[in-house]
Structures are given as structure tokens and as C-alpha cells.
């Protein structure tokens, strides 16, 4: 070994650089959380890019660059390190228009947090690990909300835009001339049943047990899905969604309750399927192969 | 294709009488808004003459008021128009529209459904 690499891998394998390398990191991360720095920031910001090139170079020197086995860009560690630097010089000194969006990979500094702390780099491995893993079981989800997303859809399709409609029209009002002319927010609480304070029309249904209009009301399909049009079964795209919502259990109960009083109340055996299968299984076989993955990873 | 079934058309003198019906009688018509008579005279515009909501109240043309009288017989999908102290002016071609919604058996549709109509002449 040539004498420039013996000093470059006794540096390397300091514990002081390491605690150096760990607190370039912290104060640059303190530094990017200020608002409006002060001009002075600037020749910090050169000294923390001079401290990671420095770093960059040693592993460099005491490795090699990329040929061999456990060279600097052979450890995927190292590439996080490299891309740092490399955007470092980019953002300083070549001009490329809109350099804001290329100062954002700064914040990629934080993340060589990682490489340093050992607890973390465990974690995060078991993460990348976990992930790898997850991917049979992602399979299995996809298709799963999939089948339940068709389901859905034939199903529930286009009931969420049954609304509870005026029983008393002007001489020359017609249905179909009420739904060319419907767009404020006014026109559909004229024409339309909706409860205190709700931001929807009133759902209801053409079958026995879905949910029925109040006296002067009749149930028509007609104007857009509630929620803005978000919440509907109109599409495969639509019903996915729908379906990972029920997956996730965000909000759920407010879809539940939509499409019940929409459909009727029988379709409430889909629902307790989409919960336990979705919710309550597939959820928790995600977790356990993370949990898994990082019992590997710490084995 | 939906259809609504009117009858009852014909020739009347002035002061005479109709009875025209309008039968949603398919199982496609699910519920309606309305169901009511419209008339367009040769040259003129298609007019509102009387509709009954589903819940029985009902709406008449100024024109018409006091002669005539719209029902409904829910059982059998129809609705009927009786026409009293016809006058000339009266004669035109009656339409019935079912304004409500519909079952293509994949989905529900709302909107309005016209009947071909029943030609009314009133003349001596």
C-alpha cells in the first residue's frame, strides 16, 4: 500500500472521523431548517460540501473507486454520498436556469445521517429488506383490491349520484332542463335535500331498503358524486380507490354509510368481506413480514 | 327502448270531452318526478298543459284551469288527462313525458322520456 493510502484508511477507521462526519451532517441539517439564513451561511455551506468531498476522498483512497469488490461504489451507502457532492457542485457552479429545484437534493444530506449512526442503517436495511420482500404480498393486495374494485363496480356504479330531487318545478322546468342548467353550489341546494350542515345532497336508493327521500322529495340520479366527485364506484380507477380507502380504514364508515343508504342496506355483506379480508388480513400480513424482514436483518 | 303508451286521441266538437291515458307500463320505469301532458299546435311551441307528481299534487297551464283534470292510477303505471268544455284552440298534438328515472337493467338513469303522442282536433 502506498503511503497516502495507509493514512487515508487509518483516517477512515478513526473513531473521531466518524463523530467529525456525524456532526457535519447534524449542523448542516440545523443549517438548512433556518428561514432566511444569513449571507455568512454561504461560507458554512462551502466548508460542509470541503468536509464531505474530504470524506468522499478518503474512502476513495483507502478503497478504491469502483473496481473491486468492496470498493467506494461498490457500498450503495456511498452513491447517497456521491450524489450529495455531485449536486453540491452542480447547484454552485454550473448554471442551469431553475437551480431551486436542484438545491432540494440538499436535504438528501440529512439521509447521510444514515450511514453514520449504526442503529439506523440497520433499520433502513430492514426496511429495503422488508421491501423486497413485500413485494409478493403487495401482489397479492393489488389483486385483491382489484377483484373487490370490480365487485364494486358492478355493483355500486353510478348510485352514489342518487339524490333526493324537489317534487314542485316551474311550467317550463323539466329534468332534463334542471340538469343542463345545474353548476353553483346554489342551484343544487335549490332543487336538492340536503341535511344540516352537510355539504352533500341527501342519498337514497330505488331498491326496498336503501335510504328514502323526505315528503315533497323523490330520488333521481343526477349531478356529480359526493365529496367533490371523489367518492364514487364509477370507474375501475374510482372503485380502486374506494377500496384502498376501505383497506386503509380512512374514513371508511362515512363510504359505508354512503353506499348502504345508495344501494341498500344487503350490501353490507360486501363491506364486512372487504374489512376482514382486506383490513384486518392483508394489513396485518404486511406487517409481519416487515416484522420479519427486521428480525432477519438484526439476526 | 323505453316507451310510453298514450291513447284516447280523436275528433271532438267544441264543449265535447277526452280521456287521454299515458301507460309507463314497462318494468323500466322505475319512479318519476312527474308525469305530465304537453301539446304543440301546428306552428307553435310544445306548452306544459297539466302534470301530476308522485306524490299526487298537481300543476295546470292558466289555459286549461277548471277543464281540465290530471290523475294517476299508481297500480297500473298510468296517467290520465280528462279533457272537459273542449275548445278549437285546444286542438294540437298531446304528448305525454315521464320525467324520472329509468332501469337500462346495468344502471339507473334519470331524465325525461316522451311519449309519440295522441292527436286532439277540435272542430265543429
Known amino acids: 500500500f502506498s503511503p497516502l493510502r495507509r493514512i487515508s484508511i487509518k483516517i477512515l477507521v478513526h473513531s473521531l472521523f466518524s463523530m467529525l462526519i456525524m456532526c457535519t451532517i447534524l449542523t448542516n441539517c440545523i443549517f438548512m431548517t433556518m428561514n432566511n439564513p444569513p449571507d455568512w451561511t454561504k461560507n458554512v455551506e462551502y466548508t460542509f460540501t470541503g468536509i464531505y468531498t474530504f470524506e468522499s476522498l478518503v474512502k476513495i483512497l483507502a478503497r478504491g473507486f469502483c473496481v473491486g469488490e468492496f470498493t467506494f461504489l461498490r457500498d450503495p451507502w456511498n452513491w447517497l454520498d456521491f450524489v450529495v457532492i455531485v449536486f453540491a457542485y452542480l447547484t454552485e457552479f454550473v448554471n442551469l436556469g431553475n437551480v431551486s429545484a436542484l438545491r432540494t437534493f440538499r436535504v438528501l444530506r440529512a439521509l447521510k445521517t444514515i450511514s453514520v449512526i449504526p442503529g439506523l442503517k440497520t433499520i433502513v436495511g430492514a426496511l429495503i429488506q422488508s421491501v423486497k420482500k413485500l413485494s409478493d404480498v403487495m401482489i397479492l393486495t393489488v389483486f385483491c383490491l382489484s377483484v373487490f374494485a370490480l365487485i364494486g363496480l358492478q355493483l355500486f356504479m353510478g348510485n352514489l349520484k342518487h339524490k333526493c330531487f324537489r317534487n314542485s318545478l316551474e311550467n317550463n322546468e323539466t329534468l332534463e332542463s334542471i340538469m343542463n342548467t345545474l353548476e353553483s353550489e346554489e342551484d343544487f341546494r335549490k332543487y336538492f335535500y340536503y341535511l344540516e350542515g352537510s355539504k352533500d345532497a341527501l342519498l337514497c336508493g330505488f331498491s326496498t331498503d336503501s335510504g328514502q327521500c323526505p315528503e315533497g322529495y323523490t330520488c333521481v340520479k343526477i349531478g356529480r358524486n359526493p365529496d367533490y366527485g371523489y367518492t364514487s364506484f364509477d370507474t375501475f380507477s374510482w372503485a380502486f380507490l374506494a377500496l384502498f380507502r376501505l383497506m386503509t380504514q380512512d374514513y371508511w364508515e362515512n363510504l359505508y354509510q354512503q353506499t348502504l343508504r345508495a344501494a341498500g342496506k344487503t350490501y353490507m355483506i360486501f363491506f364486512v368481506v372487504v374489512i376482514f379480508l382486506g383490513s384486518f388480513y392483508l394489513i396485518n400480513l404486511i406487517l409481519a413480514v416487515v416484522a420479519m424482514a427486521y428480525e432477519e436483518q438484526n439476526q | 327502448e323505453v316507451q310510453l303508451v298514450e291513447s284516447g286521441g280523436g275528433v271532438v266538437q267544441p264543449g265535447g270531452s277526452l280521456r287521454l291515458s299515458c301507460a309507463a307500463s314497462s318494468r323500466q320505469f322505475i319512479r318519476d318526478v312527474f308525469t305530465g301532458w304537453y301539446r304543440q299546435a301546428p306552428g307553435k311551441q310544445r306548452e306544459l298543459v297539466a302534470r301530476?307528481?308522485?306524490?299526487?299534487?298537481?300543476n295546470y297551464a292558466d289555459s286549461v284551469k277548471g277543464r281540465f283534470t290530471i290523475s294517476r292510477d299508481n297500480a297500473k303505471k298510468t296517467v290520465y288527462l280528462q279533457m272537459n268544455s273542449l275548445r278549437p284552440e285546444d286542438t294540437a298534438l298531446y304528448y305525454c313525458?315521464?320525467?324520472?328515472?329509468?332501469?337500462?337493467?346495468?344502471?339507473?338513469?334519470?331524465?325525461?322520456?316522451w311519449g309519440q303522442g295522441t292527436l286532439v282536433t277540435v272542430s265543429s
Open positions: 313525458l315521464f320525467s324520472g328515472t329509468i332501469s337500462t337493467g346495468r344502471e339507473y338513469r334519470s331524465g325525461d322520456y
Open positions: 301530476i307528481y308522485n306524490e299526487g299534487n298537481t
